[in-house]
Amino acid sequence: VSPTFQVVNSFAPVQECSTQLDIVIVLDGSNSIYPWDSVTAFLNDLLERMDIGPKQTQVGIVQYGENVTHEFNLNKYSSTEEVLVAAKKIVQRGGRQTMTALGIDTARKEAFTEARGARRGVKKVMVIVTDGESHDNHRLKKVIQDCEDENIQRFSIAILGSYNRGNLSTEKFVEEIKSIASEPTEKHFFNVSDELALVTIVKTLGERIFALEA
């Protein structure tokens, strides 16, 4: 508005705060994750905080163990309600091996493709949930660098349950999962004592994910 109260065009329109994220959750589904419904409860609590839709946040889920399964693609569902129903139905695929590098790499190469619903120019976020050292950790450094090169923000969650059950040292495992997280690590890495405790980090994780939108 000019001094004479005439409408004039501003030089730049006011920027809307973006609510667009493409989020792929990479779940360890090996047998040692127990009980599995702690994972689906975690998913439920996290997803119900999201405004999911083709023009808002999109969510895809990948499960890995000995191999990798796309549970659903980024563009499969167009509402939070639909995603919640689908996530509740995800069954544990099992297996003894934890191929974390394979899981992350598959998410990067496949889940984040336009064919599976990824959108150009939209921030990419990966959430990795695992409970054990990877059996393919020799590949991890390169896989993480590839994610970094593609500007994929990574949140990693270490579940210490199987280590605590076996009275094993968690030090090496925690270091590995920290290495997966984006910098600064303290904002992108979480650890929980066991699977039942996953729900305790949902609020903070959600806040940190959506802080990326700003």
Partner: antibody
Framework: EVQLVQSGAEVKKPGESLRISCKGS????????IGWVRQMPGKGLEWMGI????????RYSPSFQGQVTISADKSISTAYLQWSSLKASDTAMYYC??????????????????WGQGTLVTVS | EIVLTQSPGTLSLSPGERATLSCRAS???????LAWYQQKPAQAPRLLIY???RRATGIPDRFSGSGSGTDFTLTISRLEPEDFAVYYC?????????FGQGTTVEIK
């Protein structure tokens, strides 16, 4: 649909050998442990042992170690329980069950979420 | 080895009544790793409850589990005719699985 289908009832004489089977379907059979449970006539349930069909890693209950052999053939999604020399006291119903949980390292945990229909073994 | 003792051995009740079954462990069950199974005559056991209080898929909400440490309870809030059966508790926190001797819930 997850299913465990066991072989039919057997009547044997003491000293004979026997192998009973449990075929899994409706899930990745090589990715879950399968346990065996005995129920003697009119009695409760006893865990015998457990096998991972993917690599045939096997654990036994101390009470059954050396008494039975548990094996698997992953190519046909089947687990087996066998005796080399049956005794009258082996007369029982035998169930296989899928473990939702794990038995890696020194630690085993989990519940049995799907069960076979049972195989009745009579030794007399 | 953890020994599980179930009580009572037999529970005589009428449909619509509440059933409370007890399972006591000889030592603490780690992480509340205790399950309950139902077995009807000539049938395989069926999983009801795991991790002490989580209902298995398809189990009606009249079944509930509680407890931790050494004392666990299975409660059937209102008995239906199909609930008359034998119930077993099972612990799985010690790299071995042990079952209780069972509680029979019979029609009064």
């Amino acid at each position: 649909e997850v299913q465990l289908v066991q072989s039919g009832a057997e009547v044997k004489k003491p000293g004979e050998s026997l192998r009973i089977s449990c075929k899994g379907s409706g899930y990745s059979v090589t990715s879950y442990w399968i346990g065996w449970v005995r129920q003697m006539p009119g009695k409760g349930l006893e865990w015998m042992g457990i096998i991972y069909p993917g690599d045939s890693d096997t654990r036994y209950s101390p009470s059954f170690q050396g008494q039975v052999t548990i094996s698997a053939d992953k190519s046909i999604s089947t687990a087996y329980l066998q005796w080399s020399s049956l005794k009258a006291s082996d007369t029982a119903m035998y169930y296989c069950a899928r473990l939702q949980g794990d038995c890696s390292g020194g630690t085993c945990y989990g519940h049995f979420d799907y069960w076979g229909q049972g195989t009745l073994v009579t030794v007399s | 080895e953890i020994v599980l003792t179930q009580s009572p051995g037999t529970l005589s009740l009428s449909p619509g009544e509440r059933a409370t079954l007890s399972c006591r462990a000889s030592q603490s069950v780690s992480s509340s790793y205790l399950a309950w199974y139902q077995q009807k005559p000539a049938q395989a056991p069926r999983l009801l409850i795991y991790v002490a209080s989580r209902r298995a898929t398809g189990i009606p909400d009249r079944f509930s589990g509680s407890g931790s440490g050494t004392d666990f309870t299975l409660t059937i809030s209102r008995l239906e005719p199909e609930d008359f059966a034998v119930y077993y508790c099972q612990q799985y926190g010690t790299s071995s699985w042990t079952f209780g001797q069972g509680t029979t819930v019979e029609i009064k």
